[in-house]
């Protein structure tokens, strides 16, 4: 398996009750607006063929996509949560900027691409779904990167 380097976040990032609560509130509010319950973006298949030690790098890719292609374009919605959660997630993304894996990451890019394609195919409802799964993104980042 490729070796991951600098793929670590301090546990304290996930031990801030206020921003954790706001992230989960944002996810809950968006999930109420998500009428497509058959599709799951962050689930088992996202990690198919990806070893546990590579998953922080994978989640970094998912986080960056979510910020750039979902949260920034939808930043005027789901206030006041969005204006607090987006900077928090952006800081996590910045802290993972040096997270890379040495070697082939095609299997990871393939899984991330499937998630991207699903969001794009669903259009705005895909973006709402991604926001509704920010709790899963948060928990997966915590599990993968601490």
């Amino acid at each position: 398996a490729p070796i991951s380097s600098h793929c670590r976040l301090d546990k304290s990032n996930f031990q801030q009750p206020y921003i954790t609560n706001r992230t989960f509130m944002l996810a809950k509010e968006a999930s109420l607006a998500d009428n497509n319950t058959d599709v799951r973006l962050i689930g088992e298949k996202l990690f198919h063929g990806v070893s546990m030690s590579e998953r922080c790098y994978l989640m970094k890719q998912v986080l960056n996509f979510t910020l750039e292609e979902v949260l920034f374009p939808q930043s005027d919605r789901f206030q006041p949560y969005m204006q607090e959660v987006v900077p928090f997630l952006a800081r996590l993304s910045n802290r993972l900027s040096t997270c890379h894996i040495e070697g082939d990451d095609l299997h990871i890019q393939r899984n991330v691409q499937k998630l991207k394609d699903t969001v794009k195919k669903l259009g705005e409802s895909g973006e709402i779904k991604a926001i509704g799964e920010l709790d899963l993104l948060f928990m997966s980042l915590r599990n993968a990167c601490i």
């Epitope: 088992e44 070893s51 599990n143």
Partner: antibody
């Protein structure tokens, strides 16, 4: 309460196919993976394969050519079929559920196991 | 495949003793090691995963430590119900592999 129960014939003849069923309750097969693990008498545990929550399968390459894992979600059952068995396949066979979607390779809940003997 | 080597294969101890079991991986598995307890006639029980995370319901006398290739399971004060066989498992990559087990017996 999460429960898994293995069932199947306790005796199989050499060269035949071993067929086992894992019946689950307390969770949905479309939400969690189910793994098969076996244990030879007095020995360690050996991972055989996995049924993913979406119906895909993954196998230990040691068994790939003769192992098939399938499921029937309406009956909450996952099946294991191991073909061309020999005495070396005599073991206790377990099914186990993954912890969650992230810790999918951690086996959080196990059945009690069913003993299979391969003998003529 | 990653080979998991447990030691000792058996250990005798008394109630109240502190017991340590070790597990060594043939290549790095980061922190991704699980410990299971096996008792005759009972379903196997997940105790610890990710090296040190206690599964819900695992008593606090159990603890796990280690990373990369070397890991330990410690029982701080043995209770009568702890006499069993313990297995380590790497849950980093496929195929999932287990140690050969450590039998904890009453002295």
């Amino acid at each position: 309460e999460v429960q898994l129960q293995e069932s199947g014939p306790g005796l199989v003849k050499p060269s035949q196919t071993l067929s086992l069923t894992c019946t689950v309750s307390g969770f949905s097969l479309t939400s969690y993976s189910v793994h098969w693990v076996r244990q030879h008498s007095g020995k360690g545990l050996e991972w055989m394969g996995r049924m993913w929550s979406d119906g895909d399968t993954s196998y230990n390459t040691a068994f790939t050519s003769r192992l098939t894992i399938s499921r029937d979600t309406s009956k909450s059952q996952v099946s294991l079929k191991l073909s061309s068995v020999t005495a070396a396949d005599t073991a206790v066979y377990y099914c186990a559920r993954s912890l969650d979607f992230y810790y999918d390779t951690t086996l959080a809940f196990w059945g009690q196991g069913t003993t299979v003997t391969v003998s003529s | 495949d990653i080979v998991m080597t447990q030691s000792p294969s058996s250990v005798s101890a008394s109630v109240g003793d502190r017991v340590t079991i070790t597990c060594k991986a043939s290549k790095t598995i980061s922190k991704y090691l699980a410990w299971y307890q096996q008792k005759p006639g009972k379903a196997n029980k997940l105790l610890i995963y990710s090296g040190s995370t206690l599964q819900s319901g695992t008593p606090s006398r159990f603890s796990g430590s280690g990373s990369s290739t070397d890991f330990t399971l410690t029982i701080s004060s043995l209770q009568p119900e702890d006499f069993a066989t313990y297995y380590c498992q790497q849950h980093n990559e496929y195929p999932l592999t287990f140690g050969q087990g450590t039998k904890l017996e009453i002295k």
